[in-house]
Amino acid sequence: LNTTILTPNGNEDATTDFFLTSMPTDSLSVSTLPLPEVQCFVFNVEYMNCTWNSSSEPQPTNLTLHYWYKNSDNDKVQKCSHYLFSEEITSGCQLQKKEIHLYQTFVVQLQDPREPRRQATQMLKLQNLVIPWAPENLTLRKLSESQLELNWNNRFLNHCLEHLVQYRTDWDHSWTEQSVDYRHKFSLPSVDGQKRYTFRVRSRFNPLCGSAQHWSEWSHPIHWGSNSSKENPFLFALEAEQKLISEEDLGGEQKLISEEDLHHHHHH
């Protein structure tokens, strides 16, 4: 087999002989195909999915995953015991709660068993990769004639989370956003009784217990107020969106992460 490596512009090339089964140990000129990047997400500190894009392999390859924790009591190399598959090819590994140690450096190694020297190691801070479940049990209560309070629950993580509340009326083009700290409640001081309000919340593992960038999925929306403005076109759009959300959530397991956030990296 003859493999050639080009520079990124595709114009210059240098050819080397490259054997998938027996790579020469004394040759530094051989360039091995890079392994795909592993992306890990810890879901509500209940389980973790570490996934990779198996489609980037030029031939079907069941890559294997090993992991350990650096400089800790858990530094023994572990084999993946629960692989995730895409078209019968390994594309991820699921680790259970007992295997997750948020505050130790997680080392993950991907390897090509057909060519053991083809391997890549990454170090990850798991506390920055936590994605909580969507907030639940949204409730609204009237504090005064014009003031509303929104409350919600998060499963398990509570004080570790910050939140983002979005609300809009049936006359609004876009959402109004408000950041909320770990206290999972939000007050709207001035409510127009003639309008219908929709609220939703998402949460993030930040900043008290970690520095995660990814938000949870949005909660189910909750509504407050008048239903009288049916002639308003924005209301119809809003209701159609709500219907879509409801239908999605009825079907099977709740999707954890929006597709634009995670692309293909989230597996169930």
């Epitope: 087999l1 003859n2 493999t3 050639t4 490596i5 080009l6 520079t7 990124p8 595709g10 090339d13 050819t15 360039s31 195909l33 890079p34 894009n53 198996s54 489609s55 980037s56 392999e57 030029p58 031939q59 079907p60 895409s86 078209e87 019968e88 090819i89 594309s91």
Partner: antibody, heavy 122, light 108 residues
Framework: QVQLQQSGPGLVKPSQTLSLTCDIS??????????WNWIRQSPSRGLEWLGR?????????DYAVSVKSRITINPDTSKNQFSLQVNSVTPEDTAVYYC????????????WGQGTLVTVSS | DIQMTQSPSSLSASVGDRVTITCRAS??????LNWYQQKPGKAPKLLIY???SLQSGVPSRFSGSGSGTDFTLTISSLQPEDFATYYC??????????FGQGTRLEIK
């Protein structure tokens, strides 16, 4: 919808160089899941895979042993195409040449060029 | 390299017949076996991928089975448009990608 459009001469003299180009639409030659292949077909050899190029943070090429000393496959990112060159051709290289795309994780040729009959003759 | 051997190399059949073409790999290729149909002057067309999955738009009279080294393509009831040449192809261990030598299906 991916389409592959081949171009190049249909007649090449012995000992000269065969050159074909495959224009890609609906995908990028720099895709990180595709491989871009050349295949030829003749009555004596059947369907014969010649080689491929693919981008995975840099460019890679694989060639069939039977032609590796004479073949070059090059991507051209600016034109979103890839090309085939076969040097020192003989009448044995007379065949219909196809370009084709393969992608994971299923690894089949779903998209093919229309084919170019190349005759090697003086 | 993995060699792919198809049999028969040609066969004659009538419209409505059930036809089976076999493909054998020189070593195990799991289920990484694809079947193509080719008509004169045209590029091969994918029929079956991953040994048994029907490509979108392909009539259900085509089916594939097998894994490891032995595979079959079956046409349950031949139609006039099915008379063509059929090829198997492995993508388990590449490069090289290898094809069977083809089975020519003719009208009896």
């Amino acid at each position: 919808q991916v389409q592959l459009q081949q171009s190049g001469p249909g007649l090449v003299k012995p000992s000269q160089t065969l050159s074909l180009t495959c224009d890609i639409s609906g995908d990028s030659v720099s895709s990180n899941i595709a491989t871009w292949n050349w295949i030829r077909q003749s009555p004596s050899r059947g369907l014969e895979w010649l080689g491929r190029t693919y981008y995975r943070s840099k460019w890679y090429k694989d060639y069939a042993v039977s032609v590796k000393s004479r073949i070059t496959i090059n991507p051209d990112t600016s034109k979103n195409q890839f090309s085939l060159q076969v040097n020192s051709v003989t009448p044995e290289d007379t065949a219909v040449y196809y370009c084709a795309r393969m992608t994971g994780p299923r690894y089949y040729f779903e998209y093919w060029g229309q084919g170019t009959l190349v005759t090697v003759s003086s | 390299d993995i060699q792919m051997t198809q049999s028969p190399s040609s066969l004659s059949a009538s419209v409505g017949d059930r036809v089976t073409i076999t493909c054998r790999a020189s070593q195990s290729i799991s289920s990484y076996l694809n079947w193509y149909q080719q008509k004169p002057g045209k590029a091969p067309k994918l029929l079956i991928y991953a040994a048994s999955s029907l490509q979108s738009g392909v009539p259900s009279r085509f089916s594939g089975s097998g894994s490891g080294t032995d595979f079959t393509l079956t046409i349950s009831s031949l139609q006039p448009e099915d008379f063509a040449t059929y090829y198997c192809q492995q993508s388990y261990s590449t490069p090289p990608i290898t094809f069977g030598q083809g089975t020519r299906l003719e009208i009896k």
